[in-house]
Amino acid sequence: PEEPQLRMKNNEEAEDYDDDLTDSEMDVVRFDDDNSPSFIQIRSVAKKHPKTWVHYIAAEEEDWDYAPLVLAPDDRSYKSQYLNNGPQRIGRKYKKVRFMAYTDETFKTREAIQHESGILGPLLYGEVGDTLLIIFKNQASRPYNIYPHGITDVRPLYSRRLPKGVKHLKDFPILPGEIFKYKWTVTVEDGPTKSDPRCLTRYYSSFVNMERDLASGLIGPLLICYKESVDQRGNQIMSDKRNVILFSVFDENRSWYLTENIQRFLPNPAGVQLEDPEFQASNIMHSINGYVFDSLQLSVCLHEVAYWYILSIGAQTDFLSVFFSGYTFKHKMVYEDTLTLFPFSGETVFMSMENPGLWILGCHNSDFRNRGMTALLKVSSCDKNTGDYYEDSYEDISAYLLSKNNAIEPR
């Protein structure tokens, strides 16, 4: 397979971004993936010194289908209540806004999107000492921004001062059509402690009006990791596969696009009773990665080690008890079969995928399950050629993989 083309920006190029980035110990990494392989067989990834990751992320509006794989909701259960369109029920499709990754500053070519990521924005990753340059373009119709939960050192790229009249950068709205450049620096305080997993599961969102921005769809995963982290065997390692799972109750009643969705999908917008409890209930989507009723179907390879970065973010106000049927997982050095997630939090677990078959990923809250908060997990043998072609170029590959949200496939 061809090696991914990776451009290491030199110091002169880096000046285009910020004086801080001319440190010779810092690599600024950008990516061209026209010839990238479909999967990369690798376990070990580590780096010798901090990197600066450059991400081009846009907020974009699109119609989101919560249940693309549910062809015809059956007449029983909650399925039809939440998925079927009716004279006073919007159904399964809603206009939403998403974080989308682009290849460069032109914002013309989108990065590849995996179905499994669902509504989530691109996976952002940083180790302690790393810097993430977020080139954010608001391609939506109303003001949004992008801000991390879990990184404390966040500032505008070009200035140490916040824009006039803004107390905190997370409150600063980026207007439609505008580009704003952020510099996120991962500090020691942000990173995992010795008792934490290798990577902390965090998130980023728009914070202009967090409740409504989130209800509208702006959420993405952020991993904050040990510097040059190792696995239990002392190897500098990433797992075979990393899976980001977002348990989220999207309250479409709080979305900025509710009025537009009513106008587009209902016959008599003025006649809709917004306070009708049944109408409101039909707009509350109990989702995993933005999918309901098993529309999210994950695949992992038998015998691989899978890391799961699990978030609970949305309108749910109580804790969630999450399970993988057929599996236990390791969480904080203890094997468990249920993971407790508090609102607006994330946890990291891993497991060895030793049970083949089709399994359920869901939560113990039966009300949430009945309303669609379930996904399927298929564990099966994967026949892929083994090889160590990339063994000596782990550093470049890590940069490539981590920026692209590509799955790391097993040996």
């Epitope: 079927n84 009716g86 004279p87 587009r264 209902l266 016959p267 008599n268 006649g271 809709v272 009773q273």
Partner: antibody
């Protein structure tokens, strides 16, 4: 007052095309969707689908996908039903009906379409 | 799709009487059932929606009840102009579906 005036009866041969109009008055046309309902001779009512008068997007019931097309002329507050490649079983009276959020609150008088060779 | 079973299909009554027409849905449709009156040479008329809400301009002798799967239209003290065809229709979800109709005739 709110009313709908539909075009007159049509006599067509199999394979031909018919286009029925439904002119609305007495309300803001784009505030309400328009439903189409079929009633075959001696039969009950069958919902064909609706068109969103705000966006122009049609939704068809499964039995009416393919040969049937809903359209609008918003400036004239008029909705249209076109049936292509007419078949004998299309012989029926076709009604337009305003779509409120709760039901079809006002109906046209119906347009009779007869398909016969 | 939601199937609607309407009964009876035929009903004979005299002016002044009270009659009931029933509709049953194949699954719960909450309160979302409407009733229509069809008369020759007249446009179809919405009588009741959301199970029991009387459409404006409809006489109070018409009433609707029920929720879930079972619904009833009651016409009390029948008037001569009430003899017509009656249809129920669920407006819970698309595709909208109708009952087969009840013909109310003069005894």
């Amino acid at each position: 007052q709110i009313q709908f005036v539909q075009s007159g009866p049509e006599l067509k041969k199999p394979g031909e095309t018919v286009k029925i109009s439904c002119k609305a008055s007495g309300y803001t046309f784009t505030n309400y969707g328009m439903n189409w309902v079929k009633q075959a001779p001696g039969k009950g009512l069958k919902w064909m689908g609706w068109i969103n008068s705000y966006t122009g997007e049609p939704t068809y019931a499964d039995d009416f996908k393919g040969r049937f097309a809903f359209s609008l002329e918003t400036s004239a507050s008029t909705a249209y039903l076109q049936i292509n490649n007419l078949k004998n079983e299309d012989t029926a009276t076709y009604f337009c009906a305003r779509g409120a959020s709760y039901a079809m609150d006002y109906w046209g008088q119906g347009t009779s379409v007869t398909v016969s060779s | 799709d939601v199937q609607i079973t309407q009964s009876p299909s035929y009903l004979a009554a005299s002016p002044g009487e009270t009659i009931t027409i029933n509709c049953r849905a194949s699954k719960s449709i909450s309160k979302y059932l409407a009733w229509y009156q069809e008369k020759p040479v007249k446009t179809n008329k919405l009588l009741i929606y959301s199970g029991s809400t009387l459409q404006s301009g409809i006489p109070s002798r018409f009433s609707g009840s029920g929720s879930g799967t079972d619904f009833t239209l009651t016409i009390s003290s029948l008037e001569p102009e009430d003899f017509a065809m009656y249809y129920c229709q669920q407006h819970y979800e698309y595709p909208l579906t109708f009952g087969a109709g009840t013909k109310l005739e003069l005894k």
